[in-house]
Interface confidence: low
């Protein structure tokens, strides 16, 4: 599996990332384009230099690193700001560390990330392609203080690794703000009071609260003085307080959107109630399928058709305007044998989708909700067989086990009765003289008989062949409402 | 379930309501075969007698039970021998498998759910005023790796390897009292697999306090042995 690295080693001759802006913010010109600049380097002339799209590259081994032709007619080319790969050392907390150290700080050998022994764990490399969980190298996929690994010692589940800190300045973490934007990870203002009015403890102090959110442990988070910050991905900037009874609290930071935002409002809002219709089957080769399934036969999530990540492709809505290439829904734009999609797994380019062919009777336009009801003890069955005790039986048998014809449920001859009539039990299917089970009798469907000496008797209704339901497969599609 | 939403009726057909013999719901459970229900051991603390319990299958409403609902007595109780919070109930007669009553699938032994996998909890438990009381509710929650869940600010080392955490660290969505013993299922390929049994939490839906579930994959060998030998 190729890990697409967004960093450069040395002069970046082998950089194959997707940066497409110069260090001055100008968008790069496509390498295959001749406008506004006629290139000396193009995919045709230099096929092995990775000159895709308009990504920064270094086809001429320029010592200043990756560059590109720009879309500004006045500036032929410009250099790009590409991070140095952290191969020998780490910046910040080592979130992007890409090196090969595989021993913990106490000298224990690391367990491979794709192994579940001796420690079972949930950091499965295939599920986190961007985290570069290679071999048994120390990594930091979870906001730890620095790279770590599970150990090969059964008695020590995990431990931090000792990675030297880079001496070059760390990469810029993007724009910073004096107001609250998002969860405030880039807030760099000077508020130093919590929502309850407590003064913040200095980040470098260990009284009244001892902690590990120190400037040394979080060198890129600007833990200056006692200013509110969000170094660890909480909901908003916060700080330890100088009140020994209150360990930490959120701060009230004015929102960048002018209206003040309380920490209670920081939970994300749900998307609009747009429940797509699930069309769970397709006709023919599925070129007409317009459902919303987006899962492949092996359970992988589909990549959006308009996205080029992780797989670059030509099957775009622009190139196939009539193929319904909406979002990441399964489609068949190229007359393949059934609906398919590119997958979000970088190691599997495409797969067919987890869809069945429609049987001849199913409509191609599916109205919500797509609930397939199979007969059970409640759903009336018109077949001449019964499920369970036959309470839902609605067949046309009208003779008892001895062959005596049944009395009409509405009739009072030869037997007068008042409990089980069409009027008193309008939903029990007491039509004509058909065998029924209005009272859920364990003996099954019965009827009043036309024999004056026999009030009622059971009917001989066979059990239907039990429908086969696979484990874990509901017949009613779950709502799957988001948790928040 | 605190937060989440009211489920589509019968969309979680393995959901069981575990009741006193007088019909009061007190815990959830999961149908794993026509004759077997998996629940939490702490749900069976009140009485060691199977006759104290009955199960309700195919229900959506907690009280006004629909006519198709199946009510079955319990014939035997099996507590996990190392005192983990998981137990099996053998039904006195097999459930009728219908479109409203379908077992959940068991995971393969020792399978580990990947961190951040979105899974679903269901139950008739306490809603803490979040709407839907008395109806089966569901919520979607991400699994949180034990390493993270055991951090000081979260559950501070309380979570064992035979358990898993799930929840939003912002709080607001969680299982709660009355959901215990019920399922945490995760969709894998084309079906839902029972990965957790609702077990415990520090309060319900509190920020930084995810719910804790028994990790079913660690007990599949025990479960299959009990079912095979009984």
């Amino acid at each position: 599996k190729v890990y697409l690295s967004e960093c450069k080693t040395g002069n970046g001759k082998n950089y194959r990332g997707t940066m497409s802006k110069t260090k001055n913010g100008i968008t790069c010109q496509k390498w295959s384009s001749t406008s506004p600049h006629r290139p000396r380097f193009s995919p045709a002339t230099h096929p092995s230099e990775g000159l895709e799209e308009n990504y920064c590259r270094n086809p001429d081994n320029d010592p200043q690193g990756p560059w590109c032709y720009t879309t500004d007619p006045e500036k032929r080319y410009d250099y790009c700001d590409i991070l140095e790969c952290e191969e020998e050392c780490m910046h910040c907390s080592g979130e992007n560390y890409d090196g090969k150290i595989s021993k913990t700080m106490s000298g224990l050998e690391c367990q491979a990330w794709d192994s579940q022994s001796p420690h079972a764990h949930g950091y499965i490399p295939s599920k986190f392609p961007n985290k570069n969980l290679k071999k048994n190298y120390c990594r930091n996929p979870d906001r730890e203080l620095r790279p770590w690994c599970f150990t090969t010692d059964p008695n020590k589940r995990w431990e931090l690794c000792d990675i030297p800190r880079c001496t070059t300045p760390p990469p810029s973490s993007g724009p910073t703000y004096q107001c609250l934007k998002g969860t405030g990870e880039n807030y760099r203002g000077n508020v130093a009071v919590t929502v309850s009015g407590h003064t913040c403890q200095h980040w470098s102090a260990q009284t009244p609260h001892t902690h590990n959110r120190t400037p040394e442990n979080f060198p890129c988070k600007n833990l200056d003085e006692n200013y509110c910050r969000n170094p660890d991905g909480k909901r908003a900037p916060w700080c330890h307080t100088t009140n020994s009874q209150v360990r930490w609290e959120y701060c009230k930071i004015p929102s960048c959107d002018s209206s003040p935002v309380s920490t209670e409002q920081l939970a994300p809002t749900a998307p609009p109630e747009l429940t797509p219709v699930v069309q769970d089957c397709y006709h023919g080769d599925g070129q007409s399928y317009r459902g919303t399934s987006s899962t492949t036969t092996t359970g992988k999530k589909c990549q959006s058709w308009s996205s080029m990540t992780p797989h670059r492709h030509q099957k775009t809505p622009e190139n196939y305007p009539n193929a319904g290439l909406t979002m990441n829904y399964c489609r068949n734009p190229d007359a393949d044998k059934g609906p398919w999609c590119f997958t979000t797994d970088p190691s599997v380019r495409w797969e067919y989708c987890n869809l069945k062919k429609c049987s001849g009777t199913e409509a191609s336009v599916v109205a919500p909700p797509p609930v397939v009801l199979l007969p059970d003890v409640e759903t009336p069955s018109e077949e001449d067989c019964m499920f369970g005790n036959g309470k839902g039986y609605r067949g046309k048998r009208a003779t008892t086990v001895t062959g005596t014809p049944c009395q009409d449920w509405a009739a009072q001859e030869p037997h007068r009765h008042s409990i089980f009539t069409p009027e008193t039990n309008p939903r029990a299917g007491l039509e004509k003289n058909y065998c029924r089970n209005p009272d859920g009798d364990v003996g099954g469907p019965w009827c009043y008989t036309t024999n004056p000496r026999k009030l009622y008797d059971y009917c001989d209704v066979p059990q239907c062949a039990a429908p086969s339901f696979d484990c874990g497969k509901p017949q009613v599609e779950p709502k799957k409402c988001p948790g928040r | 379930v605190v937060g989440g939403c009211v489920a589509h009726p019968h969309s979680w057909p393995w959901q069981v309501s575990l009741r006193t013999r007088f019909g009061m719901h007190f815990c959830g459970g999961t149908l794993i075969s026509p004759e077997w229900v998996l629940t939490a051991a702490h749900c069976l603390e009140k009485s060691p007698r199977p006759s104290s319990y009955k199960v309700i299958l195919g229900a959506h409403q907690e009280v006004n039970l629909e006519p198709h609902v199946q009510e079955i007595e319990v014939s035997r109780l099996f507590l996990e021998p190392t005192r983990k919070d998981i137990a099996l109930l053998k039904l006195s007669s097999p459930a009728v498998i219908t479109d409203k009553v379908i077992p959940a699938c068991l995971p393969s032994p020792n399978y580990v759910v990947a961190d951040r996998t979105e899974c679903f909890i269901t139950g008739w438990g306490e809603t803490q005023g979040t709407f839907g009381a008395g109806l089966l509710k569901e919520a979607q929650l991400p699994v949180i790796e034990n390493k993270v869940c055991n951090r000081y600010e979260f559950l501070n080392g309380r979570v064992q390897s035979t358990e898993l955490c799930a929840g939003h660290l912002a709080g607001g969505t969680d299982s709660c009292q009355g959901d215990s013993g019920g399922p945490l299922v995760c969709f894998e390929k084309d079906k839902y697999i029972l990965q957790g049994v609702t077990s415990w939490g520090l309060g319900c839906a509190r920020p930084n306090k995810p719910g804790v579930y028994v990790r079913v994959s660690r007990f599949v060998t025990w479960i299959e042995g009990v079912m095979r030998n009984n």
Epitope: E53, S304, M308 | H168
Partner: nanobody, 124 residues
Framework: QVQLVETGGGLVQAGGSLRLSCAAS????????MDWYRQAPGKERELVAA???????NYADSVKGRFTISRDNAKDTVYLQMNSLKPEDAAFYYC??????????????????WGQGTQVTVSS
């Protein structure tokens, strides 16, 4: 999770112009595609324009030459410049983005988020 907020909708005369913005916020790790969709009353939601992280753009046939999608990756924002507006362009315009976000403990999860929509009205 990731929130998208659209702005810039409003009432404009046929032949006029509007510029829609859509800003993404939340613990975003990376955004792949950012798209504009629209939905007129009684009609299906349709893709209007899309732009990838590398700057590749796609447009619906009905808006080609009139609408321009652009994107500021540093600001996690996408724009839709709409010129020569026609009455049939009137609709709710929704922003859609997919990529990875890091939720609280920084483990990546995929997202595919929608904005709440902004209304564009074109009078003739």
């Amino acid at each position: 999770q990731v929130q998208l907020v659209e702005t810039g909708g409003g009432l404009v005369q046929a032949g006029g112009s509007l510029r829609l913005s859509c800003a993404a916020s939340g613990n975003i790790f990376s955004i792949n595609a950012m798209d504009w969709y629209r939905q007129a009353p009684g009609k299906e939601r349709e893709l209007v324009a899309a732009i990838t992280s590398g700057g590749t753009t796609n447009y619906a046939d009905s808006v080609k030459g009139r609408f321009t999608i652009s994107r500021d990756n540093a600001k996690d924002t996408v724009y839709l410049q709409m010129n020569s507006l026609k009455p049939e362009d009137a609709a709710f315009y929704y922003c859609n983005a997919d990529g990875y976000y890091s939720d609280y403990d920084k483990n990546l999860a995929e997202f595919n988020s929608w904005g709440q929509g902004t209304q564009v009205t074109v009078s003739s």
